[in-house]
């Protein structure tokens, strides 16, 4: 028997509380693939992070760094301070 949840498109989740019908992702959440039983919470770009792309019903928010900082890690998981003019970046910092 086909799983009824497989019919739920990205941007929705299969709602067990409503007889496995597809429901829109709740506020501040998304699902990037179909057949999901929950939606994922949107990433918040706060502090030294700034929003490069808003969260949608089907894709997470993307962050970059505020001026004076640059991204490090997959998906800009960290922001590191830029070196001042005349300084160079080493493993220990500027």
């Amino acid at each position: 028997l086909q799983d009824p949840c497989s019919n739920c498109p990205a941007g929705t989740f299969c709602d067990n509380n409503r007889n496995q019908i597809c429901s829109p992702c709740p506020p501040n959440s998304f699902s990037s693939a179909g057949g999901q039983r929950t939606c994922d919470i949107c990433r918040q770009c706060k502090g030294v992070f700034r929003t490069r792309k808003e969260c949608s019903s089907t894709s997470n928010a993307e962050c970059d760094c505020t001026p004076g900082f640059h991204c490090l890690g997959a998906g800009c998981s960290m922001c590191e301070q830029d070196c001042k003019q005349g300084q160079e970046l080493t493993k220990k910092g500027c």
């Epitope: 498109p9 929705t12 709602d15 409503r18 429901s23 829109p24 709740p26 969260c55 019903s57 089907t58």
Partner: antibody, heavy 120, light 111 residues
């Protein structure tokens, strides 16, 4: 009886902020989302955003990102919509509407609307 | 983010049937069965007439029906009556960060 009662009309100067309230009664406040929709004079409906009164999570229309803030007070079953940096184009009737049911694709009950006029 | 496309006006005589279209894309109307229709009389708040493409809330006349084909949703009003004269708006869930989108509205005139 389900009711959404909104605050009264407001007149604001450009650059100011406005905070519209929407008091819910007749249902379990935290079980239903609240949408905010506006309508400029003689124009169509425009979706602004949605709030989950249970946890307070929000999603805003791209057009209003950075200018709109939706909050709620569960003790009084009231949702608030604050719009900042007002301009003349923000002159409109602002409606709150209950999402029906919990993760709903529609709004079954609407407030009476709050007229916000932005004028210098 | 542009609105869903509706005809500006549709008219019909009492007793006739009329259909209002609402055209979007595969990212909204075509991608989801979360299409609603609202009726709005002048100076009043909108009223939900159809939700989830074709479901009718209790209290809404059976003369109102909804359907969808591809990227276009439709609202049909059969047995047109004078009180049906109003503005009608479609609304759809979308994949964009603007999660819900309205059509531009259709003014229905009963001749």
């Amino acid at each position: 009886e389900v009711q959404l009662v909104q605050s009264g009309a407001e007149v604001k100067k450009p650059g100011a902020s406005v905070k519209v309230s929407c008091k819910a009664s007749g249902y379990t406040f935290t079980s239903y989302y609240t949408h905010w929709v506006r309508q400029a004079p003689g124009q169509g409906l425009e979706w602004m955003g949605i709030i989950n009164p249970s946890g307070g999570s929000t999603s805003y229309a791209q057009k209003f990102q950075g200018r709109v803030t939706m909050t709620r007070d569960t003790s009084t079953s009231t949702v608030y919509m604050e719009l900042s940096s007002l301009r003349s184009e923000d002159t409109a009737v602002y409606y709150c509407a209950r999402g029906a049911p919990e993760y709903s694709s529609s709004s079954d009950y609407w407030g009476q609307g709050t007229m916000v006029t932005v004028s210098s | 983010q542009s609105a869903l496309t509706q005809p500006a006006s549709v008219s019909g005589s009492p007793g006739q049937s009329i259909t209002i279209s609402c055209t979007g894309t595969s990212s909204d109307v075509g991608g989801y069965n979360f299409v609603s229709w609202y009726q709005q009389h002048p100076g009043k708040a909108p009223k939900l007439m159809i939700y989830d493409v074709s479901k009718r809330p209790s209290g809404v006349s059976t003369r109102f029906s909804g359907s969808k084909s591809g990227n276009t949703a439709s609202l049909t009003i059969s047995g047109l009556q004078a009180e049906d004269e109003a503005d009608y708006y479609c609304n759809s869930y979308t994949t964009s960060s603007t999660r819900w989108m309205f059509g531009g509205g259709t003014k229905v005139t009963v001749l």
